[in-house]
């Protein structure tokens, strides 16, 4: 539902690379939308060499994208699905995930989300936009702005907690994941550490806290002693294959 915030999210998964494409290099000028620097999506949509990114569900795409068949706006029935650019305000939609951050799908149209639509504690549009890539994007119209982020901080591999654009910016054993205020380098999860499986298919929360993926030889699985727990509270941890 709209009233759920995806907080604990293994949004950064071991996904295949974009079809025929590679990510940009640290230190390069990259066109990005504020608040939408995510791994595993079509990261650099504004670049000429953009390649589609295959997906099975919305959560495998960046927060400025949704998963769908390229030939139709809704989720396709069968066939290859890819991450498509989110729909801006006043554009047609069929579910919340289709609308860009700060908007939600109402009566088939992407509408701006104000505080009455979100519970207390959910991150607001202005913060998700402002904190994403450190550009003042609090535009009067509320649209996520495309801006160019050219930063000298990516020349050396980021240590734990330092800001990043993508996992290649981080030192070994770290991945790039959102941590409330920014995207930072976080440790890849070890055996026994809590991870999160995406279960939601149609809902789309604002991902304000992401965990890294499980380390090599580990998989995110339900903890054995939590099998009896209710679906909503089942705990997943990184476990040996």
């Amino acid at each position: 539902t709209l009233n759920s915030v995806l907080i604990n999210s293994n949004a950064i998964k071991n996904l295949p690379p974009p079809l025929g494409g590679a990510g940009g290099q640290p230190g390069s000028a990259v066109s990005v939308a504020p608040g939408v620097l995510y791994e595993g999506g079509n990261k650099y949509q504004t670049l000429d060499n953009y390649q589609p990114y295959p997906c099975a569900e919305d959560e495998e795409c960046g927060s400025d994208e949704y998963c769908s068949s390229p030939s139709r706006g809704a989720a396709g029935v069968g066939g290859v699905q890819i991450c498509l650019a989110c729909r801006k305000r006043r554009k047609r939609c069929m579910r919340h995930a289709m609308c860009c951050p700060g908007n939600y799908c109402k009566n088939g149209i992407c509408m701006p989300s104000d505080h009455s639509h979100f519970p207390r504690g959910e991150i607001e549009e202005s913060i998700i936009e402002n904190l994403g890539n450190d550009h003042n994007a609090a535009a009067g119209d509320g649209y996520p702005r495309r801006t160019t982020l050219t930063s000298k901080i990516y020349h050396t591999k980021g240590q734990e907690g330092s800001v990043c654009l993508r996992s290649s910016d981080c030192a070994a054993g770290l991945c790039c994941a959102r941590h409330f205020w920014s995207k930072i380098c976080k440790p890849v999860l070890k055996e026994g550490q809590v991870c999160t499986k995406h279960k939601r298919k149609g809902s789309h929360g604002l991902e304000i806290f992401q965990r890294c993926y499980c380390g090599e030889g580990l998989a995110c699985r339900i903890q054995k002693d939590h099998h009896q727990a209710s679906n909503s509270s089942r705990l997943h941890t990184c476990q040996r294959h």
Partner: antibody, heavy 116, light 111 residues
Framework: QVQLVESGGGLVQPGGSLRLSCAAS????????MSWVRQAPGKGLEWVSG????????HYADSVKGRFTISRDNSKNTLYLQMNSLRAEDTAVYYC?????????WGQGTLVTVSS | DIALTQPASVSGSPGQSITISCTGT?????????VSWYQQHPGKAPKLMIH???NRPSGVSNRFSGSKSGNTASLTISGLQAEDEADYYC??????????FGGGTKLTVLG
């Protein structure tokens, strides 16, 4: 190793101003968000303000909004907190802290006393 | 405003295990699943002990562990030692307030 050293605290009259500094070393200062957190005598911790790595985004607790200004000088590896219109309830030890994975490194703090 | 409730004080003998609770609401602790714990010795700066509910930063003893059930997060210290005597603060995150701290718990190691 990571080091944060605050300075600039002292005794000031209500309505007065003070500027705190935090000198950072042992890490790439310009790659981290930074925060100020305060602790009134015998009380708990209260987050005061945060600033993004380049300084273009700043955020404040309601209790200090409009009176305090956070800033940074990445060329000097220094974080600042300009405090204006000080009140008795602003009396506290002020810590600067690195916003890594949460507040992962803290300075030793500087005491600000607001009293007439 | 978000408020995190901690017991004012907890005590235990060396070698024992103690647990400090931190109770919030479904809007913060319960909904976010994200709680951190800090240790503060008298006259010293706070130190991050647990993040993301149960993860220890490097250098923190494995005697410290965190967990969460419903709207309550817990910090457990096993094999209590004299140097564990300190104030402990839980912290969660709020989109308006950034860092929200509990009122703190004074841990006394007896004997």
């Amino acid at each position: 190793q990571v080091q944060l050293v605050e300075s600039g605290g002292g005794l000031v009259q209500p309505g007065g101003s003070l500027r705190l500094s935090c000198a950072a070393s042992g890490f790439t200062f310009s790659s981290y968000w930074m925060s100020w957190v305060r602790q009134a005598p015998g009380k708990g911790l209260e987050w005061v303000s945060g600033i993004s790595y380049s300084g273009s985004n700043t955020h404040y607790a309601d209790s200090v909004k409009g009176r305090f200004t956070i800033s940074r000088d990445n060329s000097k590896n220094t974080l600042y907190l300009q405090m204006n219109s000080l009140r008795a309830e602003d009396t506290a030890v002020y810590y600067c802290a690195r916003m890594g994975i949460d507040l992962d490194y803290w300075g030793q703090g500087t005491l600000v006393t607001v009293s007439s | 405003d978000i408020a995190l409730t901690q017991p004012a004080s907890v005590s235990g003998s060396p070698g024992q295990s103690i647990t400090i609770s931190c109770t919030g609401t479904s809007s913060d602790v319960g909904g976010f699943n994200y709680v951190s714990w800090y240790q503060q010795h008298p006259g010293k700066a706070p130190k991050l002990m647990i993040h993301d509910g149960s993860n220890r930063p490097s250098g923190v003893s494995n005697r410290f562990s965190g967990s969460k059930s419903g709207n309550t997060a817990s910090l457990t210290i096993s094999g209590l030692q004299a140097e564990d005597e300190a104030d402990y603060y839980c912290q969660t995150w709020d989109s308006l307030s950034f860092f929200v701290f509990g009122g703190g718990t004074k841990l006394t190691v007896l004997g």
